[in-house]
C-alpha cells in the first residue's frame, strides 16, 4: 500500500502544472454560485420556475425601478477592505406578498386579503419606508375610487373586527389599470413590535358603483398584479474590534 | 507511512503550477453559490417554482423600483471590510405576503385577509418604514373609494374584534386598477413588541356603492395583486471581537 | 501595485485580473430577478506562495505545501458589491447588496 | 497594493483579478429575483504556496504543500457587497445586502 501511494504521488506531481492551467471558467462560476448562496444565507438555490416568477413578479413601478438601476454597480466610496463581517448580503428592500392566514380565513368562510408574514429579523426601527402597493383594475368610464385599507383586529365587544389604516380618494379614467401605493410604515412597525397584532388587512377600492377595483386575488391574465408590501430597511453593520 | 507522505508531497509539489490552471469558472460559480446561501443563512436554496414566483411576485411599484435600482449596485457607505461578524446578509427590505392565521380562520368560518407572520428576528425599533400595499380593481365609473384597514383584536366584552389602523378616501377614475400603499409602521412595531397582538387585519376599499375594490385574495388572472407588507429595516450587525 | 488586467489571450503569467461574467440565466437561477448577469472578474497568476482560499473568488485547489511555508497568492485586493433583486423562497422578493461580488483588482497577498 | 486586473486573454501569471459573472438564472436560482446575474470577479494567479479557498474569485487548486510551510495565496484584498432581492422561503421577499460578493482587489495573503 505504501508503494502504491508513492507511485500515485509521483504521477500527480508530474501533472500539477498542467492541471493548474485546466481550470475553467465553469468552475469559477460554480464557486461564485456557492458564494452567493452563502452570502444570502441560503443552503440551496430557491426552487422557483420561470412560470412562477412570471406569475409572482409584481408588474409595478418599483420592480422596474430596481431593475433599471442595475447599470451602476460600484460603490465609489467603499474602501473595500476585506473584513469578515462584510461577507453576507444586506437587505435593503423586501417585497412581501400576501400569504394565507388562518385568522383571515375564519372570519366569514371565504379567503380575504391580505396577511403579510414578516421575519423576526426585521427590526421595526430599521424600517425606513413601507408601502403597500395595490393594483386597481381598469375602469370603463371615468370614476372616483375610494381606497380603504383596514387592519384586522381581534373582535371587540361591539363586533368591530377592523380598524382603518388609510383611506384615499382618486380619479380614474378608462384605460389601463394603475398601481397605487399606500404608506404602511407605522402599521408595519407596530406589527414588528407586536407580531401578535398582525392579523391581516383588508383592501377595498370601490368605484362610484361599488365595484371593487383592487386586485387582491389575481384572476386570469392578472399575473403580477397582487398587492404587495415594499419595505425599505436601513442596515448599518457594526464593526468588530481587531 | 512517513516515507509515503514525503513522496506524496514531493510529487504534488512538482505539479502545482498545472493544477493552478485547471480550476474552472464552474467551480468558482459553485463556490459563490454556496457562499450566497451561507450568507443568507439558508441551508438550501428556497424551493420555489417559477410558477410560484409568478403568483407571488407583487406587480406593484415597489418591485419595479427595486428591480430598476439594479444599475446602482454599489454601497456608497460601505467600507467593504470583511470582518467575520459581517459575513451574513443584512436585510434591508422585507416584502411579506399574508399567511394563514388560525385566529382569522376562526372568526366566522371563512378565510379573511390578512395575517402577516413576522420573524422574531425583526426588532421593532429597527423598522424604518412599513407599508401595506393593496391593489384596487378598476372601476367602471368615477367614484370615491373609502379604504379602511382594520386590525383584528381579541374580542372585547362588547364583542369588538377590530380596531382601525388607517382610513383614507380616494377618487378613482375608470381605467386600470391601482396600487395603494398604507403606512403601517406603528402597527407593525406594536406587533413586533407584542407578537401576540398580531391577529391579522382586514382590508376594505368600498366605492360609493359599497363594492369592495380591494384585491385581497387574487382571482384568476390576478397573480401578483395580493396585498403585501413592504418593510424597510435598518440592520446594524454587531462586530465580533478579534 | 495597481494590479494587472488581462484577458483570455494575455500571456501574462503574473497575478492578473481577468474578465468573468456570471450569467444567472445561463445556469437557471431564475429566482434572481436582477441582475440577470454581472461581471465578476477573477484573479489568476503567479505569486511566490499560494495560500488557503478564504473566498470562492479565490478558487484554489487544496494541496499540501511541500515547503511548509506560507507564500502569497493571487487574490482580489479590491472588490465591489452588487445589488441583487431576488426571490428568497419565502413569498418575498429581496433587494439587497451582496458585498465582494465583483473583482476590481487582483494582487498577490 | 492596488492589484492586477486581467481577463481571459491575459498571459499574466501573477495573482490577478479576472472578470466573472454569476448568472443565477443560468443555474436555476429563480428564487433570486434580482439581480439575475452579477459581476463577481475572482482572484487567480501565482503565489508561492497554495492555500485553502475562501473566495471563488481566486480559483486555486488546493494541494498539499510539499515543503510543509504556509505560503501566501492570491485572494481578494478588497471586496464589496451586492444587494439582492430574493424569496426567503418564508412567504417573504427580502431585499438586502450581501457583503463581500464582488472582488474589488486580489492579492496574495
Amino acid at each position: 500500500e505504501n508503494s502504491e501511494q508513492k507511485e500515485n504521488v509521483e504521477k500527480e506531481g508530474l501533472c500539477n502544472a498542467c492541471t493548474w492551467r485546466q481550470n475553467t471558467k465553469s468552475s469559477r462560476i460554480e464557486a461564485i454560485k456557492i458564494q452567493i448562496l452563502s452570502k444570502l444565507r441560503l443552503e440551496t438555490a430557491p426552487n422557483i420556475s420561470k412560470d412562477a416568477i412570471r406569475q409572482l413578479l409584481p408588474k409595478a413601478p418599483p420592480l422596474r425601478e430596481l431593475i433599471d438601476q442595475y447599470d451602476v454597480q460600484r460603490d465609489d466610496s467603499s474602501d473595500g477592505s476585506l473584513e469578515d463581517d462584510d461577507y453576507h448580503a444586506t437587505t435593503e428592500t423586501i417585497i412581501t406578498m400576501p400569504t394565507e392566514s388562518d385568522f383571515l380565513m375564519q372570519v366569514d368562510g371565504k379567503p380575504k386579503c391580505c396577511f403579510f408574514k414578516f421575519s423576526s429579523k426585521i427590526q421595526y426601527n430599521k424600517v425606513v419606508k413601507a408601502q403597500l402597493w395595490i393594483y386597481l383594475r381598469p375602469v370603463e368610464t371615468p370614476t372616483t375610487v375610494f381606497v380603504q385599507i383596514l387592519r384586522l383586529i381581534k373582535p371587540m365587544k361591539d363586533g368591530t373586527r377592523y380598524t382603518g389604516i388609510r383611506s384615499l380618494k382618486l380619479d380614474m379614467n378608462p384605460g389601463t389599470g394603475i398601481w397605487q401605493s399606500i404608506d404602511v410604515k407605522t402599521v408595519l412597525q407596530n406589527w414588528l413590535k407586536q407580531p401578535e397584532s398582525n392579523l391581516g388587512i383588508e383592501i377595498k377600492a370601490l368605484d362610484e358603483n361599488g365595484h371593487d377595483l383592487a386586485v387582491t386575488f389575481p384572476g386570469p391574465g392578472e399575473d403580477g398584479l397582487n398587492p404587495f408590501l415594499e419595505v425599505k430597511v436601513t442596515d448599518t453593520p457594526k464593526r468588530s474590534r481587531r | 507511512e512517513n516515507s509515503e507522505q514525503k513522496e506524496n508531497v514531493e510529487k504534488e509539489g512538482l505539479c502545482n503550477a498545472c493544477t493552478w490552471r485547471q480550476n474552472t469558472k464552474s467551480s468558482r460559480i459553485e463556490a459563490i453559490k454556496i457562499q450566497i446561501l451561507s450568507k443568507l443563512r439558508l441551508e438550501t436554496a428556497p424551493n420555489i417554482s417559477k410558477d410560484a414566483i409568478r403568483q407571488l411576485l407583487p406587480k406593484a411599484p415597489p418591485l419595479r423600483e427595486l428591480i430598476d435600482q439594479y444599475d446602482v449596485q454599489r454601497d456608497d457607505s460601505s467600507d467593504g471590510s470583511l470582518e467575520d461578524d459581517d459575513y451574513h446578509a443584512t436585510t434591508e427590505t422585507i416584502i411579506t405576503m399574508p399567511t394563514e392565521s388560525d385566529f382569522l380562520m376562526q372568526v366566522d368560518g371563512k378565510p379573511k385577509c390578512c395575517f402577516f407572520k413576522f420573524s422574531s428576528k425583526i426588532q421593532y425599533n429597527k423598522v424604518v418604514k412599513a407599508q401595506l400595499w393593496i391593489y384596487l380593481r378598476p372601476v367602471e365609473t368615477p367614484t370615491t373609494v373609502f379604504v379602511q384597514i382594520l386590525r383584528l383584536i381579541k374580542p372585547m366584552k362588547d364583542g369588538t374584534r377590530y380596531t382601525g389602523i388607517r382610513s383614507l378616501k380616494l377618487d378613482m377614475n375608470p381605467g386600470t386598477g391601482i396600487w395603494q400603499s398604507i403606512d403601517v409602521k406603528t402597527v407593525l412595531q406594536n406587533w413586533l413588541k407584542q407578537p401576540e397582538s398580531n391577529l391579522g387585519i382586514e382590508i376594505k376599499a368600498l366605492d360609493e356603492n359599497g363594492h369592495d375594490l380591494a384585491v385581497t385574495f387574487p382571482g384568476p388572472g390576478e397573480d401578483g395583486l395580493n396585498p403585501f407588507l413592504e418593510v424597510k429595516v435598518t440592520d446594524t450587525p454587531k462586530r465580533s471581537r478579534r | 501595485d495597481f494590479g494587472l488586467d488581462c484577458d483570455e489571450h494575455s500571456t501574462e503569467s503574473r497575478c492578473c485580473r481577468y474578465p468573468l461574467t456570471v450569467d444567472f440565466e445561463a445556469f437557471g437561477w431564475d429566482w434572481i430577478i436582477a441582475p440577470k448577469r454581472y461581471k465578476a472578474n477573477y484573479c489568476s497568476g503567479e505569486c511566490e506562495f499560494v495560500f488557503l482560499q478564504k473566498y470562492p473568488h479565490t478558487h484554489l485547489v487544496h494541496q499540501a505545501n511541500p515547503r511548509g511555508s506560507a507564500g502569497p497568492c493571487c487574490t482580489p485586493t479590491k472588490m465591489s458589491p452588487i445589488n441583487m433583486l431576488y426571490f428568497n423562497g419565502k413569498e418575498q422578493i429581496i433587494y439587497g447588496k451582496i458585498p465582494a461580488m465583483v473583482v476590481d483588482r487582483c494582487g498577490c497577498s | 497594493d492596488f492589484g492586477l486586473d486581467c481577463d481571459e486573454h491575459s498571459t499574466e501569471s501573477r495573482c490577478c483579478r479576472y472578470p466573472l459573472t454569476v448568472d443565477f438564472e443560468a443555474f436555476g436560482w429563480d428564487w433570486i429575483i434580482a439581480p439575475k446575474r452579477y459581476k463577481a470577479n475572482y482572484c487567480s494567479g501565482e503565489c508561492e504556496f497554495v492555500f485553502l479557498q475562501k473566495y471563488p474569485h481566486t480559483h486555486l487548486v488546493h494541494q498539499a504543500n510539499p515543503r510543509g510551510s504556509a505560503g501566501p495565496c492570491c485572494t481578494p484584498t478588497k471586496m464589496s457587497p451586492i444587494n439582492m432581492l430574493y424569496f426567503n422561503g418564508k412567504e417573504q421577499i427580502i431585499y438586502g445586502k450581501i457583503p463581500a460578493m464582488v472582488v474589488d482587489r486580489c492579492g496574495c495573503s
Epitope: 425601478e65 447599470d71 | 423600483e65 377614475n173 | - | -
Partner: antibody
Framework: QVTLKESGPVLVKPTETLTLTCTVS????????ISWVRQAPGKGLEWVGI???????YKASWAKGRLTISKDTSKNQVVLTMTNMDPVDTATYYC?????????????WGQGTLVTVSS | DIVMTQSPATLSLSPGERATLSCTSS????????LSWFQQKPGQPPKLLIY???TLAYGVPSRFSGSGSGTDFTLTISSLQPEDAATYYC??????????FGQGTKVEIK
Amino acid sequence: QVTLKESGPVLVKPTETLTLTCTVSGIDLSHTDISWVRQAPGKGLEWVGIISYAGSKYKASWAKGRLTISKDTSKNQVVLTMTNMDPVDTATYYCARGVPAYSHGGDLWGQGTLVTVSS
Amino acid sequence: DIVMTQSPATLSLSPGERATLSCTSSQSVYHANWLSWFQQKPGQPPKLLIYWASTLAYGVPSRFSGSGSGTDFTLTISSLQPEDAATYYCAGGYGGGRYAFGQGTKVEIK
C-alpha cells in the same frame, strides 16, 4: 380626466437650452413614472428618458450629459431640460405615462410639442 | 448600444388579409417579455396595443395579437381593417435604465 400636455418653446437656437414642461392631471406623480419620447419629422420614435415615481432618472445614452429631468409633484409637472441643442434635435417631443416596454407603460400620451432648432 | 430591427419597413396588404410584423432585438429584453407594440397615425401620438409581449392593451381590438420571447417578437393583425393603416413600433426594455424603439413598420392598405 387623466391628461398629459407638453408645453415649451417652438423655436430654439443651436447651442441653447431647451426646457419643456409636461403638465399632468388626474395622475399622481408620486405613484407614476413619466417618460419622454421624441420623433424627428418623418422619422421613428426615439426614447429620451424617464423620471420614475420615486424620482430616479434614466436617460438614453445619447442624452447623458445634456439631459435633466425633474418633477414638481405638487404642481403636477415634469420638466425636461436639454442643453446644447442642435438642429438634429428638431423633433416632436412627447411625454407619456409609465415606461414604454414595461407593463402597460405608454398607455397615455400627450399630443406632443414640435421643437425646431434653427438659427 | 441596443438595436431593435423591425421588418418589413413597409407592408402593403388588402383589407381582410393577415399582417405579420417582426421585431428583433440585438439583445434579450428583460425577463424575456419587456416588449410593447405601439400604433401611430400621422399627426397623432402613439397608441399602446400590446404589452408584456402578448398582453392586449385595454380597448384594443382582438384582431391584434403579440407573440415572441427574448429577442424575436411578432405583432399579428389577423384581419386588416382600413383603420389599421399606420406605422407600428416595438419598444423594448433591458434593465439598467435602457429602453429602445424599433424604427417602425408602415402598414398600408391597398
